[in-house]
Each structure stands twice: as C-alpha cells, then as structure tokens.
C-alpha cells in the first residue's frame, strides 16, 4: 500500500505544529523530566512496511486521544490545537486505508498486535504521569517534547522502511 505523497508533508506539518505549541521553556522544567520508555524497537524490527503501518496508525490514534482531552484543551492554544487535530485526522485516514488493505498480509499478525500493545502501554505511562503531575504546565511541556521526539522517531523509521522498499 502506497501512502500518498502528502502523508510525509502531513508528518512534517504535525511536527511543526507541535513545535509551535510550546508555551514554556523545557529548561525551566528539568526537574519534571521523565523517561516514558518509548518502544522504538516496535517500529524498527518490523521488516515489512505492512507490519509497521498499523503500529504507526496506533501511535497517531493515541496522540489524537491524548491531545483531545479537556485537560489538553486547557493547556494549549485552541487555534494550533485545531490545526493539529486536522493534520492527525488526515494522517489517520491515509493510514487506515493501508491498514484495511494490509489485513492478512503481515508475516506474524500477533507480533504486530504485541507492538500495538506496547504503544498503548507507552501512552498509559504518559497519561499516568500527567495525572500524577496534576496536568501542570511543566508536565504538559515534558509530554509535548516527548511526543515530538517519539513521533519524529516513528515516522523516520517508517520513511527508512519505505526507501528500503
């Protein structure tokens, strides 16, 4: 399944919007830094693009869920957040077509499911962290930076798989 050329552009726009959303300096939040244990290997050990796409879809779905809570709405600029939703929604649509098209073509569907579970657990850790930090501005800034990093890593891995093929 070939993703539209606009998908890569959408990923870049998503990262750009995440960068623009920054409200405070991460340096003022050093005491709140946290290792969320991004499951990078779940994007790197899937040898076929068809196996990575559902995992990337899950990643974007979870980002969408995280930023569409009422606590998130209170933390970020509404206009930027709306643009961010639009970008994520478009990417989910692109990937969904490939997920449906790729059903049954993966080498080990249960490996893919374990990867999806690993992504869900990663976001559970992020949600728990925000809750424990009472959704403070610094906690949200740490999470924003983390999502930028993990989203960038996962899309880069997806791109490198695409270029290999």
């Amino acid at each position: 399944c070939d993703l539209p050329q606009t998908h890569s552009l959408g990923s870049r726009r998503t990262l750009m919007l995440l960068a623009q959303m920054r409200r405070i300096s991460l340096f003022s939040c050093l005491k709140d830094r946290h290792d969320f244990g991004f499951p990078q290997e779940e994007f790197g050990n899937q040898f076929q693009k068809a196996e990575t796409i559902p995992v990337l879809h899950e990643m974007i779905q979870q980002i969408f869920n995280l930023f569409s809570t009422k606590d998130s709405s209170a933390a970020w600029d509404e206009t930027l957040l709306d643009k961010f939703y639009t970008e994520l929604y478009q990417q989910l649509n692109d990937l969904e077509a490939c997920v449906i098209q790729g059903v049954g073509v993966t080498e080990t569907p249960l490996m893919k499911e374990d990867s999806i579970l690993a992504v869900r657990k990663y976001f559970q850790r992020i949600t728990l962290y925000l809750k424990e930090k009472k959704y403070s501005p610094c906690a949200w800034e740490v999470v924003r930076a983390e999502i930028m990093r993990s989203f960038s890593l996962s899309t880069n891995l997806q791109e490198s798989l695409r270029s290999k093929e």
Partner: antibody, heavy 115, light 113 residues
Amino acid sequence: HVKLQQSGAELVKPGASVKLSCTASGFNIKDTFIHWVKQRPEQGLEWIGRIDPANGYTKYDPNFQGKATITADTSSNTAYLQLSSPTSEGTAVYYCASRVDYAMDYWGQGTTVTV
Amino acid sequence: DIELTQSPATLSVTAGEKVTMSCKSSQSLLNSGNQKNYLTWYQQKPGQPPKLLIYWASTRESGVPDRFTGSGYGTDFTLTISSVQAEDLAVYYCQNDYSYPLTFGAGTKLEIK
C-alpha cells in the same frame, strides 16, 4: 489487581441465541485484545476469535464465523460473546482471555453453556 | 491453518522426576523480523481455566516456577519440568501464536503416580 469476571451458567434451547459477558477490572479493555476460547466436556481448547475493543476490529476462526459474534462495550469495560442458533455441539465452557502483555495472559473463570 | 501435534497424550510420572513433552507445528512459528518463535504453553489444572506458562517458546511468564522450561525453534518445541511436583497435575497445551486462526495442540495430560 487484574481480573476477568464472566457471567453465570446458561441453559439454552437449541436454535435460541445466548450472550455471555466478560467484565474486566484492574485494566481498561481498550488497552488490550480480548479472546474467546471454547472447551467442550473432557476436550481440548478451541479458539473462537478476538476483538480489539479500542476499534471493534474482530477476527474469527472460520469454523465460528457466522455462529459467534464478539463485541465490546468500553464504557462498561465488558466484552461479549453471542452464540447464535447453537446445537448440542455448543455445550461447553466458554472462556474469555485478555492479551495484556504477551499471549493470553489473563483468563476468566469460564461460563458453562448447556444446549 | 497451523496444526500442532502434542506427544505423548498422557504422561504418568513420580514426584521429583524430570519430564519432557513435545509440540510439533505443521509450519515454522519463527518470525524473521525479531527472531522470536511464536509458540505458547498453557497449564490447565482440573476445574480451572488455562494459565499462561511460557510465551515466545522459551520466555517464562512472571511467577511461573523455574522448574518449567520451554525450548525449541521453528517447528519443534519442548516443555520440560525439571522436578515434577504433585501440584503440576494438569493438562499442558501448546498454542500457535504466530498466525490466525490461533490453534491449540490436543494437550498432554500429566498424571502423578
């Protein structure tokens, strides 16, 4: 503490349908996959199918396609198995199991269905 | 569909003995991407639901005694109990965790003499 609580035993007339429930506590079903497994008296285990409660996507063993329907309600943290028009072959213990980490790592206590 | 053949059907042993049971798959359960074998072992004691023992052919589930060891690669797998205890009386099932539909072996019944 992770637990899967299944509904009570069912006595069903052949041809009638029955809906079994599996309620999770200690975790969100939308963060996992829920499987259903059948075990006839003194027999082995047969996989029926599974659901990803986060999106409702299901997979079934071809032998159960059309005879069993798996659904989930994330608001009540419950998964369901509906058996339509069962025959005497449907007499069995039905287990729900969740894939929280790897494989089917948590199991319900089982529901006995007698047709 | 992947077929799993377990042997023997029944094992009758004395407490303290070492036992091995076999599970053979009709096709390879090895994933080339992560080099893991997608075979799982479950233990089912009388009147209880199955319990996960081993996943990825050799990884012991947390809380499972270290007398249980899973081994094997590709199509041939083994579950070993180094020193059988009375509480190990159960049926042991292997399961294809590689592809849908998921399939189970017919089971090996462990009896204690």
